[in-house]
């Protein structure tokens, strides 16, 4: 029950996270004009990954796409790539995790297969979240380094005086959406990986024993060895009990003093 809940919650959290990553990638407000020194401005500039926008005092907003690839900085291209990779991985992860959900029955799918799919989707969500966080962080770093760089001239109009104003850009809403969304996707992925451990088939004890008859008075001690799934420690059919019961490897060994009465 706890495993199903963890898996389901992980799926929902990742779903919200990936939706957030998509939203952040599409948003125009990755960088916004810093209004610290000029809170009442007639023009408000902001940029996204795909277009640059201007909101004018009358309420009119104009956005222009970046119709060039070569004219854009490599960092911006890298951010675009990271966000797209994050979305693609997240989308594949969601698709895989739907089939991996314990509450959904698809044919006669083994629990081990569901466990593997859960782990796969979990890893995909983790990488997707990391891509989004990395992309947003790279953009944020680019903003910080360019904070004082971008300048523009503005005429005040009265008497035609020229006033040089620095158009500085600060963090936009999309950055915060991206960070939160990336974090949620990451958390969802971790939850899926945790759920995977619970979904894996548990170790089963079999009372199977191999022994040889060495006389009519064999002191037989029932024992056994574990048939392991690989998750346990007894993976090499080690002898569990001493006595007449032997592991497969010991069948042709020399008789011990305990074999005869």
């Amino acid at each position: 029950m706890a495993v199903t809940a963890c898996q389901g919650l992980g799926f929902v959290v990742s779903l919200i996270g990936i939706a957030g990553i998509i939203a952040a990638t599409c948003m125009d407000q990755w960088s916004t004009q810093d209004l610290y020194n000029n809170p009442v401005t007639a023009v408000f500039n902001y940029q996204g990954l795909w277009r640059s926008c201007v909101r004018e005092s009358s309420g009119f907003t104009e956005c222009r796409g970046y119709f060039t690839l070569l004219g854009l900085p490599a960092m911006l291209q890298a951010v675009r790539a990271l966000m797209i990779v994050g979305i693609v991985l997240g989308a594949i992860g969601l698709l895989v995790s739907i089939f991996a959900l314990k509450c959904i029955r698809i044919g006669s799918m083994e629990d081990s297969a569901k466990a593997n799919m859960t782990l796969t989707s979990g890893i995909m969500f983790i990488v997707s979240g990391l891509c989004a966080i990395a992309g947003v962080s790279v953009f944020a770093n680019m903003l910080v380094t360019n904070f004082w760089m971008s300048t523009a001239n503005m005429y005040t109009g009265m008497g035609g005086m020229v006033q040089t104003v620095q158009t500085r850009y600060t963090f936009g809403a999309a950055l915060f959406v991206g960070w939160v969304a990336g974090g949620l996707t990451l958390i969802g992925g971790v939850m899926m990986c945790i759920a995977c451990r619970g979904l894996a088939p548990e170790e089963t004890n079999y009372k199977a024993v191999s022994y040889h008859a060495s006389g009519h008075s064999v002191a037989y001690k029932p024992g056994g060895f574990k048939a392991s799934t690989g998750f346990g420690s007894n993976t090499k059919n080690k002898k569990i009990y001493d006595g007449g019961a032997r592991t497969e490897d010991e069948v042709q060994s020399y008789p011990s003093k305990h074999d005869y009465v």
Epitope: A42, N45, V54, E62, Y66, P73, A152, N153
Partner: nanobody, 123 residues
Framework: QVQLVESGGDLVQAGGSLRLSCAAS????????MGWHRQAPGKQRELVAM???????NYADSVKGRFTLSRENTKNTVHLQMNKLKPEDTAVYYC?????????????????WGQGTHVTVSS
């Protein structure tokens, strides 16, 4: 440096016509909005007409049907055709433009004002 150069202001009789022009020099990358504002003596500056890059034109209620704002496609130039002028249209007319400063992705748009041209309508 971008500058707005206005022309066409004059003294005109009531009921007459006048054409104001505003040209943005200094080869700006493109306009977001361009238009005209006016300031009558002792009054606040008000919007007369505004043209957006999407082609929408807005007019003040007091000038609707009398004034027409047009743009030259080849240049960042706007013309305000003023017909049936009234004495209350007397004011200093200022050209205002929001222009993009370049094609670079970080290029900001800024607001620019002209120095103003006087329009006097006598009764």
């Amino acid at each position: 440096q971008v500058q707005l150069v206005e022309s066409g202001g004059d003294l005109v009789q009531a009921g007459g016509s006048l054409r104001l022009s505003c040209a943005a020099s200094g080869s700006p990358f493109g306009f977001v909005v361009m238009g005209w504002h006016r300031q009558a003596p002792g009054k606040q500056r008000e919007l007369v007409a505004m043209l957006t890059s999407s082609g929408t034109t807005n007019y003040a209620d007091s000038v609707k049907g009398r004034f027409t704002l047009s743009r030259e496609n080849t240049k960042n130039t706007v013309h305000l055709q003023m017909n049936k002028l009234k004495p209350e249209d007397t004011a200093v007319y200022y050209c205002r433009a929001v222009l993009r400063s370049g094609s670079d992705w970080r290029a900001a748009a800024n607001e620019y004002w002209g120095q103003g041209t006087h329009v006097t309508v006598s009764s």
